[in-house]
């Protein structure tokens, strides 16, 4: 007779990342008896929900249930039925919902209420939906990448997780770029964090970490573009906006009502003599870069050093993992550069050439890429360079310490894993005691 495999003693967890532009569902799995070990939780599935972010459902909340169905059903398939009732489900909403809440707390509550109703109808252990703070988003992203890189483990590893992993236990900083906000989080070197709002203290696996974090609301790539358009249309002589951040020959009509819908453009709002205007691309990297820099107020700093808008930023320290849109955009340019490892100077040179290429040529060269994304790569790439170099003060040298990361050991870099690890109490404050053989079954 055949030997029957013993049922796996594993646990599962689900986190939904309700971002400003879309929602993604992540399924995590870990060996039940190794919950407190570092690096044992891994992602088994990502399901991208079809449609926009949940904040866009404010006028059609009755569609939220259907919107979430496919990915929740996928979770039902992936996770064994016997595990459903003990599988926690968490939904965290980020800057898109923070912005909606700024406009109307009642409308944000309405969306979250329907999300909770919809998710609680599944057989999992639903643990609630909430809008996470920018500080949490930064902190959990930092925890995720360092957990996956094995930085919290006191065990010396004889293998390298990722090609660029340094063998020491110095943590990586985290750079996260979303659609509506961007986060910078790292452990500064013996530096006092001058602003208490930006200081976090963690004790993880027996070690203390003093972490700096800040989330810049409205400086995600989509909201930054809205800001730039709102700023530039102020000085346009008519309803034509000649825009250096789009390719020559590119044209797009924008509704003024859409432009002023977001709280991010309020500071640039003015009464315009037209309801629509047309973006006409002129494709000039240098001018685009200059226009983007005007979004960063660097004239005021009440601290020893600032990023922009008067926000304290300590001197940069160590290696950084840049993920989410930082990765997606730079991964596109890596393909444009035929996969060569690119220095900051090379990226800048490539951006100049790329932005200057005519739109018709770009569409032909990258026919497999959705036009909405393709049309915005010139802006997004320029914005990333501006944010990292002028916003966060990376230099040509420190640029070499930025690692654009999509996944680490098969798990997406992002805040969701850190969020789940925290809520399921899977990161102990002290280093767990382990028997000599406790790690023999996995690496």
């Amino acid at each position: 007779t055949q030997n029957k495999a013993l049922p796996e003693n594993v646990k599962y967890g689900i986190v939904l990342d309700a971002g400003s532009s879309h929602t993604s569902l992540y399924i995590y799995k870990w060996p039940a008896e190794k919950e407190n070990d570092t690096g044992v939780v891994h992602q088994v599935e990502e399901c991208r929900v079809k449609g926009p972010g949940i904040s866009k459902f404010v006028q059609k909340v009755n569609e939220i249930g259907i919107y979430l169905t496919d990915c929740m059903e996928r979770a039902r398939e992936v996770i064994p039925r016997s595990q459903h009732q003990e599988t926690p489900v968490y939904l965290g909403a980020t800057a898109g919902m923070r912005l909606l809440r700024m406009e109307s707390e009642e409308l944000a509550d309405r969306v979250l209420d329907v999300v909770e109703r919809s998710l609680s109808n599944y057989p999992f252990d639903f643990q609630g939906a909430r809008i996470i703070t920018g500080q949490e988003e930064g902190a959990y992203g930092w925890i995720t990448i360092n957990y996956l890189l094995g930085k919290f483990s006191q065990k010396t590893r004889w293998f390298s997780i990722v090609p660029y992993e340094t063998n020491n236990q110095e943590t990586f900083g985290a750079l996260d770029l979303g659609g509506a906000s961007t986060q910078v989080t790292f452990v500064p070197q013996n530096q006092t964090i001058e602003s208490p709002d930006n200081a976090l203290q963690f004790r993880l696996y027996g070690k203390d970490y003093n972490v700096y974090t800040h989330s810049f609301l409205c400086y995600g790539k989509d909201q930054a573009l809205w800001q730039k358009l709102a700023k530039d249309i102020q000085v346009a002589s008519n309803e034509i906006l000649r825009d250096p951040c789009f390719h020559p020959g590119y044209k797009k009509v924008v509704n003024v009502s859409d432009l002023y819908k977001t709280p991010c453009t309020k500071r640039f709002e003015m009464t315009l003599p037209f309801q629509q205007f047309e973006i006409q691309g002129i494709g000039n990297y240098q001018q685009c870069h200059q226009s983007i820099l005007e979004l960063f107020n660097t004239s005021y700093c009440p601290y020893s050093q600032c990023a922009f808008n008067g926000i304290f930023l300590p001197p940069l320290q160590g290696d950084f993992g840049a993920f989410s849109a930082f990765y997606f955009v730079m991964d596109f340019f890596k393909k444009v550069a035929k996969n060569s490892v690119i220095s900051q100077e090379k990226v800048t040179e490539m951006m100049k050439k790329f932005c200057a290429q005519p739109w018709e040529e770009i569409k032909t060269s990258y026919a497999g890429v959705k036009e909405k994304y393709l049309s915005e790569y010139c802006f997004s790439g320029t914005y990333i360079l501006s944010l990292l170099l002028q916003g966060y003060h990376f230099t040509a040298d420190s640029w070499e310490h930025i690692h654009f990361i999509g996944k680490i050991q098969g798990s997406d870099a992002g805040w969701t894993l850190g969020y789940m690890l925290n809520l399921t109490n899977m990161i102990p404050a002290e280093q767990p005691l382990s028997t000599p053989l406790s790690h023999s079954t996995y690496v």
């Epitope: 909340v61 939220i64 309405r110 639903f126 609630g128």
Partner: antibody, heavy 120, light 113 residues
Amino acid sequence: QVQLVQSGAEVKKPGSSVKVSCKASGGTFSSLPISWVRQAPGQGLEWMGGIGFGTANYAQKFQGRVTITADESTSTAYMELSSLRSEDTAVYYCARGGAKYAGRYGMDVWGQGTTVTVSS
Amino acid sequence: GIVMTQSPDSLAVSLGERATINCKSSQSVLFSSNNKNYLAWYQQKPGQPPKLLIYWASTRASGVPDRFSGSGSGTDFTLTISSLQAEDVAVYYCQQYYLYPLTFGGGTKVEIK
């Protein structure tokens, strides 16, 4: 001032269905969820489910047997319970609120209750 | 779901004396985003629907006398009637509205000694 008025008492046979209505007056019907709570004779309160902004959800115990709907045009919510058994004999209440977000003040307005008796 | 456990099942208190009812939830109902506890207390008199007394664990609903007060946070909550009146004879229920399914405690019957 919002008021919830429920339909009258019902006597039903085992295996049949009952549909209880809850009409709101004096306020915006769509602004808060409506919960349905039942109370068997001499027993405590038991949440059955609720509806808010077009989305219903139900306690696991009643899943598949209860349907909660709302008609905004008449400001009326409905609770239909099928495959009735004698244990379903209870007073059924509708109440405004109860959700973490949209009903953040608890269930602040209650209907007068509808007695449903299930007997052969 | 979250299990709500009330104690005692019944309570006999002299008029003018203090009555204390406890409620324990199987998991925290404290919402970190706004630091509020999603817990309500209801009073139910015979033949009547329940009446909301307290929401957010400690906020009195409109028209509720100030002898009723709620306290506690996380998983442990208390309803206190500082000076029992004859009209306070009723069954009292706690309820969490932090997560679906919404759940009630089993109830505490308050009588006059």
